[in-house]
Interface confidence: low
């Protein structure tokens, strides 16, 4: 295949260097990949890629004069699964109608641009799991409510790290099935409001490392399995552990926070029917309390049975009734940061 401006190999077109000032109108409509690198594109015009029904990937990178992406640029492309827009510091405006009807989209990267707002993803309607990778856009300051509704019918991963995010509104993630949310390195982000996850399922993984966040929301952390909050020095307290029912791994800033998990063992799945026998329940409660293992973090009306327990001394097969997990937490308390100094002996008992 040949083209007057772009290099071509097996339906992949690479258009590069300063001679490329607009998207060539004569690119074959059955191209599977288009790459625009180091070009002098100032505007990507409406419908620039219309009719590219086989197109799977678009890359627009290192385009230092690019300022505007118009409406209907990434629209009605049934095979498109990857869009990369990066290193375009003068890109200030992406039309809200730029992304529409992309049923196979799996990866959207927008990094190192000058955009002031998150791209509008409401009309993408992907049928696939989507990784939305928006990072190093220092002029993005706010995440509005409903910012990701309509992105995907499946689950999403949001990498929103290293932007200039200072404020996230309640219901920001409404309508999403959130596998992972990375907000790390937004150095001026101070607050996750209480209802930030209202209407969302998840997150399963949350990273708030190197932010100024001082507290986690009271609601919406029921599915959280992994929490990363390294160098998050303002985060002085965690929610009660009952709000973190799914937590398996925590990577925190202060060793003292790991003390909360030291003696907290969590039941992770349905127990075998034999475990419901009242005789077993009584024996277990007795054994755990006698050995000082009832967690003071449990609610008053909650038995150690429902919190997880050690069956070592009972006659039952404890594997059936001991489906519990310890939360893996770091940094671990040590001789210089002992739990006793922070929490005292009583709470540990």
């Amino acid at each position: 295949c040949h083209h007057r401006i772009c290099h071509c190999s097996n339906r992949v077109f690479l258009c590069q260097e300063s001679k490329v000032t607009e998207i060539p109108s004569d690119l074959p409509r059955n191209a599977i990949e288009l790459r625009f690198v180091l070009t002098k594109l100032r505007v990507i015009q409406k419908g620039a890629f219309s009719g590219f029904g086989d197109l799977e990937k678009i890359e627009i990178s290192q385009n230092d004069v690019l300022e505007v992406i118009e409406a209907d640029v990434f629209s009605n492309l049934p095979k498109l699964h990857e869009i990369r827009i990066e290193k375009a510091n003068n890109l200030l405006y992406i039309n809200p109608e730029a992304f529409q009807n992309l049923p196979n989209l799996q990866y959207l990267l927008i990094s190192n641009t000058g955009i002031k707002h998150l791209p509008d993803v409401h009309k993408i309607h992907s049928l696939q799991k989507v990784l939305l990778d928006i990072q190093d856009n220092i002029n993005i300051h706010t995440i509005e409510r409903n910012s990701f509704v309509g992105l995907s019918f499946e689950s999403v991963i949001l990498w929103l790290n290293k932007n200039g995010i200072q404020e996230i509104h309640n219901c920001a993630f409404n309508g999403t099935q959130l596998d992972e949310l990375n907000l790390s390195d937004n150095n001026n982000l101070e607050e996750l409001p209480n209802d930030v996850f209202h209407g969302a399922s998840g997150p399963v993984i949350l990273d708030i490392s190197r932010t100024r966040i001082h507290s986690l929301p009271s609601y919406g952390l029921e599915n959280l399995k992994k929490l990363r909050a390294r160098s998050t020095y303002n985060l002085k307290k965690l929610p009660t552990l009952e709000k973190l029912v799914a937590l398996m791994e925590a990577s925190l800033t202060y060793p003292s926070h790991c003390c909360a998990f030291a003696n907290w063992r969590r039941q992770i799945s349905e127990l075998h029917p034999i475990c419901n026998k009242s005789i077993l329940r009584q024996e277990v409660d007795y054994m755990t309390q006698a050995r000082g293992q009832r967690s003071s973090l449990a609610e008053d009306n909650e038995s150690s049975y429902s919190r997880g327990f050690d069956m070592t001394y009972t006659e039952f097969d404890y594997d059936l009734c001991n489906e519990v997990v310890d939360v893996t937490c770091s940094p671990k308390p040590d001789a210089f940061n002992p739990c006793e100094d922070i929490m005292g002996y009583n709470i540990l008992r």
């Epitope: 009719g51 029904g53 086989d54 009605n76 049934p78 049923p103």
Partner: antibody, heavy 116, light 108 residues
Framework: QVQLQQPGAELVKPGASVNLSCKAS????????MHWVKQRPGQGREWIGE????????NYNEKFKSKATLTVDKSSSTAYMQLSSLTSEDSAVYCC?????????WGQGTLVTVSA | QIVLTQSPVIMSASPGEKVTLTCSAS???????LYWYQQKPGSSSKLWIY???NLASGVPARFSGSGSGTSYSLTISSMEAEDAASYFC?????????FGGGTKLEIK
Amino acid sequence: QVQLQQPGAELVKPGASVNLSCKASGYTFTSYWMHWVKQRPGQGREWIGEINPRNGRTNYNEKFKSKATLTVDKSSSTAYMQLSSLTSEDSAVYCCARLSVGFAYWGQGTLVTVSA
Amino acid sequence: QIVLTQSPVIMSASPGEKVTLTCSASSSVSSSYLYWYQQKPGSSSKLWIYSTSNLASGVPARFSGSGSGTSYSLTISSMEAEDAASYFCHQWSSYPPTFGGGTKLEIK
């Protein structure tokens, strides 16, 4: 020239499975998605799904997700569709097709008859 | 999913007559992804018109296509015997791709 070759017919018993083949020639097999379409007399055509021979990635019509499984064998440039738990409703002509902008090629289709 | 309804289901036309086949969509379809195919008995389907109005390779110039949104048509300016066949429309503007039921065009 581009050709998609399919066996003419398959007779299968209810509850059984059948594996339909579609041998491609005349083009680079891994450069184009392969589609499968069901055609029943008087009921029009229904898109079953598609597979990317390069990486095996598939998309299915929700209606056929538990009925059809698409695979490819790159070494022989052949696409396959397995239909499981067959009933009389699955009796139809099944066509493979290479659909692309400005170019489309269809196999003749395999007539699947489900009968005891 | 988008339902495509073709009309008429069967029609006859005399040689030289102008013929119009229509394809109506239940919701809007991008014109880039509206296709027409021709099928004759014992043969596989052939792409006839793509992206609403572009004739596929080898299709006679008497054929044309037009439309937008929910309404599309295929027109034969002057019917010839070899045009007798079934024609069906197809969209993959949105998933799953769907097909019209077809129009059987006969020669009088």
